[in-house]
Every structure is written in structure tokens, then in C-alpha cells.
């Protein structure tokens, strides 16, 4: 396979990565598509040009119980609750009870390495796409989509509106994160197009919740994830020697 070739022996520099990707491009094109059925790597959806892999959580170890309160200080003013003179009944009746009766199907136990949204094998046409959250509501949110407490310096990354709070990065991410970041940079340069993966959180544990956090490729791509995966494995193997 091309990753064994000389161009892919040293993936520590960007130029080498580019060479490796160029060398592997024919192999990648010849691969079986990740989403079979429509002749290329795109899922069968209403919008085949968009490849979304929402909420990849490389870093989630087991299931967290995030029942911490998000309450702000007690002295904060209230904007959303209008004052009422008395406590009379509401003019309109409340909602009628639903007869959904749906019982939840809890996930089976804890997994040591929780990757339930890393959907290599998800059926054709399925992709996770949460609705974006705009906490500031009617204010212009292009610069500040989330509370400051959640913001982290995103070096080399664009904070897309609607994307969410980012917890502090783990110190242990280290070399693997560097490699992965280089691969992503290489992928973007290769295509010279908007390959946006700015909230693809490789190494940091979630704070309370990741919002948005999906990646999209606006142009049809060869399945570079396969290359990334193999390159990462290869790199890890080399380090182990």
C-alpha cells in the first residue's frame, strides 16, 4: 500500500505529508467507498455534497454524568420573564397530555472508550446534524456565539457561528494531536477548498457538552479518513519501536 512508500515514511513535516497524500491519491481513489451505493464516498442524502461527521468524540472515556448546574449568579437581571401582577390562571389552557408513552432504550452499559458517534458503519445516508445553538438570541452573534466562560483560544481555527463551547485541552494530546492537525492542514491545502474541521476535537475532554461540532467537506472528497487512520496507526507503531 502507498503508505509503505518512501514518501510516507516520515510524516513529521507538512511537505512530507503533502507528498504522501499526493502519492496515495490514486490508491485512495481506487478504494471501496465508505458509503457504498452511489459510486463515490458521499452518503446518499438530500445534499450529497455535504459530508458531515458530527460530534466525533475521540476523547470521551466512558459516559459522563453532566448534571452540573449551568446557573449564573443570583444577582443577574432577568430579561426573559415578564413581570406579572398576580398569579391568576393562564388565559389559555396548557398543552394536552401526550400519549407518546415511549420508553427510553438506555444504552447498554458503560464502554471504556465511548465512540458512539464515530459512525464508520452507520447505514447509508445517515449523518448526525444537531441544530445550532444561538444563546445570544436576537443579538448579532458573529463574534460571540457562546458565553466567554466556554471560549478557548482557537489558534489557527475559525470559530464558526453556532459552533459551541470548547473545554480546555488535555495535556496528554501531544504528538498525536500534532500529527492529526498536520494531516488536516494537508487535506485542506491539497484541496485548496474549504475543508472545515475547526471543531473536530481530537484531544480535549468535553466540558459540559459540545454544541455544533460537526465537520463538513463542501467538495466531493476521496475518503481521506482512511489515510488519516492508517497514518495515525503507522505513526503510533513507529513511536512504539
Amino acid at each position: 500500500w502507498c503508505l509503505e512508500s518512501s514518501q510516507c515514511q516520515d510524516l513529521t513535516t507538512e511537505s512530507n505529508l503533502l507528498e504522501c497524500i499526493r502519492a496515495c491519491k490514486p490508491d485512495l481513489s481506487a478504494e471501496t467507498p465508505m458509503f457504498p451505493g452511489n459510486g463515490d464516498e458521499q452518503p446518499l442524502t438530500e445534499n450529497p455534497r455535504k459530508y458531515v461527521m458530527g460530534h466525533f468524540r475521540w476523547d470521551r472515556f466512558g459516559r459522563r454524568n453532566s448534571s452540573s448546574s449551568g446557573s449564573s449568579g443570583a444577582g443577574q437581571k432577568r430579561e426573559d420573564v415578564s413581570a406579572g401582577e398576580d398569579c391568576g390562571p393562564l388565559p389559555e389552557g396548557g398543552p394536552e397530555p401526550r400519549s407518546d408513552g415511549a420508553k427510553p432504550g438506555p444504552r447498554e452499559g458503560k464502554r471504556s472508550y465511548s465512540m458512539e458517534h464515530f459512525r464508520w458503519g452507520k447505514p447509508v445516508g445517515k449523518k448526525r446534524r444537531p441544530v445550532k445553538v444561538y444563546p445570544n438570541g436576537a443579538e448579532d452573534e458573529s463574534a460571540e456565539a457562546f458565553p466567554l466562560e466556554f471560549k478557548r483560544e482557537l489558534t489557527g481555527q475559525r470559530l464558526r457561528e453556532g459552533d459551541g463551547p470548547d473545554g480546555p485541552a488535555d495535556d496528554g494530546a501531544g504528538a498525536q494531536a500534532d500529527l492529526e492537525h498536520s494531516l488536516l492542514v494537508a487535506a485542506e491545502k491539497k484541496d485548496e477548498g474549504p475543508y472545515r474541521m475547526e471543531h473536530f476535537r481530537w484531544g480535549s475532554p468535553p466540558k459540559d457538552k459540545r454544541y455544533g461540532g460537526f465537520m463538513t467537506s463542501e467538495k466531493s472528497q476521496t475518503p481521506l479518513v482512511t489515510l488519516f487512520k492508517n497514518a495515525i496507526i503507522k505513526n503510533a507503531y513507529k513511536k512504539g519501536e
Epitope: V131, K132, G162, D208
Partner: antibody, heavy 114, light 110 residues
């Protein structure tokens, strides 16, 4: 200050077609937002109809709405909801909203009756 | 599709009291949950997102908690102005029927 306003509601006969418009002020749909439609039948709860990603034009609907409801972005300041084959069950106040936020229009009432 | 079951349908508490509203998802929605307050003749207003994050400007008397499939909105030190209908909404996945509202809870303040 961003604002949304729905229009196009009114009385329509069963089987008819109606297009509602959500007009934004202080907000440009040429930017990327999730703009959604939600409805509420009189005295009932809220029901999600679908959303459009105004940047890409991608649309998303629940199974029940697919085929009969179509969300589009005809201009940089408006998002439309086209409803076909209307029945009495579609009688509701229709809201447009910016994703998950407090930015909602006041709603427009659609009454389907013969 | 994800079904949100909200309980109770209606609750009545005196001023100063506490109300607890529960929302159960038919599958794990990973805290992609919002709580809204709606008063008659008005559109809903966002109170909480991410299951527990309070929207700026909303009183800290509103508290959201939960994870997985079970979520709770707690309103403490009830005021008359809290009389409204409250809805939970999951925004987990627009692409796979993963956005829906709970049936709503009418809160009456005595």
C-alpha cells in the same frame, strides 16, 4: 437587534397550498444560520417542522413533514415554508426561529377549513 | 425518531415554592436539550441549552440538569411571572428525526 416576522398565514381550503415567509431584519441569511419552522395548534404543544442551513441551503425535516413541507431561502432576508395538501390538522400558528435561541417571530396563524 | 416525554402535563405551586419538570428522551441525546418558557400569545423564550447552561439574562432560579435520556428543569422560589408553559426540546439530530419537543408542562403559580 435581530428580528423575525412571519407572513402569509390565513384561511385556506383543505387540499390547498400555502407559502409562509419569514423576513429577517438585522440578520442576513447570506450568512450561515440554522433557520427553523415550528408550529403550534391551538391549545397544543410545539411541533418542529424543519430547518434550513442558510449557508449551504441544506434542509432537514422530520419524517412526517417530508414531501408536504418545503423550506427554502428565496433571498438573503427571507426564508419560506411551502405547505401542500393542507388538512384541518395543519391549522396552527407557524413560527420561524433562528436555530435554538430566543429569536422567534411572533407567528402567523394558518386556518385550514372549507 | 426521538420522542420526548415531558411530565407532568400541569403543576400548581404557591409563590416561593419549587417546581420540577422532567423530560425523558427515547434515546440518549447527549445533553442536546433546551428548555423554553412560553406565555399565551407569545413565542417561546429560551431558558436553558445544553441541558444545564443558563441563557444569559435568565434568572438563576431556573436550573437544568440531567444526561443521557433523563433531564430536569427546576424552578425554585416561584414568582407569579413564572406562570407559563414550559417545553423541553432536543436538537440532537436534524438529519434523522432527532429534533422534537416535549408535550409541555403548564405551571400555575398560586
Amino acid at each position: 437587534q435581530q428580528q423575525l416576522e412571519e407572513s402569509g398565514g390565513g384561511l385556506v381550503k383543505p387540499g390547498g397550498t400555502l407559502t409562509l415567509t419569514c423576513k429577517g431584519s438585522g440578520i442576513a441569511f447570506s450568512d450561515t444560520y440554522d433557520m427553523c419552522w415550528v408550529r403550534q395548534a391551538p391549545g397544543k404543544g410545539l411541533e418542529w417542522i424543519g430547518c434550513i442551513d442558510t449557508g449551504s441551503g441544506d434542509t432537514y425535516y422530520p419524517t412526517w413533514a417530508k414531501g408536504r413541507f418545503t423550506i427554502s431561502k428565496p433571498s438573503s432576508t427571507t426564508v419560506d415554508l411551502k405547505m401542500t395538501s393542507l388538512t384541518a390538522a395543519d391549522t396552527a400558528t407557524y413560527f420561524c426561529a433562528k436555530g435554538v435561541s430566543s429569536l422567534w417571530g411572533q407567528g402567523t396563524l394558518v386556518t385550514v377549513s372549507s | 425518531d426521538i420522542v420526548m416525554t415531558q411530565t407532568p402535563a400541569s403543576v400548581s405551586e404557591p409563590v416561593g415554592g419549587t417546581v420540577t419538570i422532567k423530560c425523558q428522551a427515547s434515546e440518549d441525546i447527549e445533553s442536546d436539550l433546551a428548555w423554553y418558557q412560553q406565555k399565551p400569545g407569545q413565542p417561546p423564550k429560551l431558558l436553558i441549552y445544553g441541558a444545564s447552561t443558563l441563557k444569559s439574562g435568565v434568572s438563576s432560579r431556573f436550573r437544568g440538569s440531567g444526561s443521557g435520556t433523563e433531564y430536569t428543569l427546576t424552578i425554585s422560589d416561584l414568582e407569579c411571572a413564572d406562570a407559563a408553559t414550559y417545553y423541553c426540546q432536543t436538537y440532537y439530530d436534524m438529519a434523522d428525526d432527532g429534533c422534537s419537543f416535549g408535550g409541555g408542562t403548564e405551571v400555575v403559580v398560586k
